[in-house]
């Protein structure tokens, strides 16, 4: 399976919502034995590989944002702790899952990984990411709405795993 | 915070079975692997096998013949069972926590089980 | 299975040096490598994950790096608590594996 970024790059301005996507692409094995863990952090494109490096999200952990369920079953972080950090990760039954972030500010401006392991039990873990840029914008140049530029089909292919 | 803690007869007779299990407290028992990790004494550490919350269980295959750890969810708990121990199985045994595509992020403090007749 | 294997075996330092310590494994293991401390009567300690990312409240002084099959932890100036046993263990498949230990002692 391979993780689409439907958009490699949001452009918003302070104070608006945003919801960064991700796409589980290919088959997905539904058996007992295999799950899915999916989880967001904010990285750099340094370091050994693009997303590599994991870094909170407004001081919460991959963990804290992780979303847990089996194929393409739906699930969002019920955590209040990620609420009150005006923050939600979520999935749907079509192998989308997103992150909002909510009242966004300049410190929010960065690289964004969205991270699937597919857990095969007696095998191993297989990774697979995607990253997105967010760039938050003040003053007469932001625009009013969050914009989105659309992924080449080659990066919105990206794969890295093991 | 979460917390594990390990308890369990600190000795076995040798064939015998040895019974552990370790309880969550502060925190899901939910999307993680509970782990169990043994180190004789002076050596290092050994990966003896982890369940899913789901129930899926994965083991050492140097062990896998005697082992089996099983999960009760409404109690927080999960458990080991290593049966025909010898001398050889005298370790202290640990209980952690790992994260799927990380490491063992939380540990229990580890119980000295002695395999003697 | 993948073999981890750490050097030095025992690292004799003085408190304010700097600590390099080595893990090779049998084969690849990408950068899925984790480093643990322990201390004696204690449980090992997370201290690295995926080669190079500190663990949940882990000093800056402690650093990871390397992919493949060569890793290094390096403690840039040692601190009298860091005098300890420093295991790795990778990830990339399934039976997990620990090195054996580098034990960091007082010169």
């Known amino acids: 399976f391979k993780v689409a970024t439907p958009y490699s790059l949001y452009v918003c301005p302070e104070g608006q919502n945003v919801t960064l996507t991700c796409r589980l692409l290919g088959p997905v094995d539904k058996g007992h034995d295999v799950t899915f863990y999916k989880t967001w952090y904010r990285s750099s494109r340094g370091e050994v590989q693009t997303c590599s490096e994991r870094r909170p999200i407004r001081n919460l952990t991959f963990q804290d944002l992780h979303l847990h369920h089996g194929g393409h079953q739906a699930a969002n972080t019920s955590h209040d702790l990620a609420q009150r950090h005006g923050l939600e990760s979520a999935s749907d039954h079509h192998g989308n899952f997103s992150i909002t972030m909510r009242n966004l500010t300049l410190l929010d401006s960065g690289l964004y990984c969205c991270l699937v392991v597919e857990i095969r039990h007696h095998h191993s873990e297989h990774r697979v990411h995607g990253a997105m840029e967010l760039q938050v914008q003040t003053g007469k140049d932001a625009p009013s709405n969050c914009v989105v530029y659309p992924s080449s089909s080659q990066d919105s292919e990206n794969i890295t795993a093991a | 915070q979460v917390q594990l803690q390990e308890s369990g007869p600190g000795l076995v007779k040798p064939s015998e079975t040895l019974s552990l299990t370790c309880t969550v407290s502060g925190g899901s028992i939910s999307s993680y692997y509970w782990s169990w990790i043994r180190q004789p004494p002076g050596k290092g550490l050994e990966w003896i096998g982890y369940?899913?919350?789901?129930?899926?269980?994965n083991y050492n295959p140097s062990l896998k013949s005697r082992v089996t750890i099983s999960v009760d969810t409404s109690k927080s708990q999960f458990s080991l069972k290593l049966s025909s121990v010898t001398a050889a199985d005298t370790a202290v045994y640990y209980c952690?926590?790992?994260?799927?595509?990380?490491?063992?992020?939380?540990w229990g403090q580890g119980t000295m089980v002695i395999v003697s007749s | 299975e993948i073999v981890l294997t750490q050097s030095p075996a025992t690292l004799s330092l003085s408190p304010g040096e700097r600590a390099t310590l080595s893990c090779r494994a049998s084969?690849?293991?990408?950068?899925?490598l984790a480093w643990y401390q322990q201390k004696p009567g204690q449980a090992p300690r997370l201290l690295i994950y995926?080669?190079?990312n500190r663990a949940t409240g882990i000093p800056a002084r402690f650093s990871g790096s390397g992919s493949g099959t060569d890793f290094t932890l390096t403690i840039s100036s040692l601190e009298p608590e860091d005098f300890a046993v420093y295991y790795c263990?990778?990830?990339?498949?399934?039976?997990?594996?620990f090195g054996g230990g580098t034990k960091v002692e007082i010169k």
């Open positions: 952690a926590r790992d994260i799927p595509a990380s490491a063992f992020d939380i």
């Open positions: 263990q990778q990830r990339i498949n399934w039976p997990l594996t």
């Open positions: 084969q690849s293991v990408s950068y899925y």
């Open positions: 995926d080669a190079f």
């Open positions: 369940i899913y919350y789901s129930g899926s269980t």
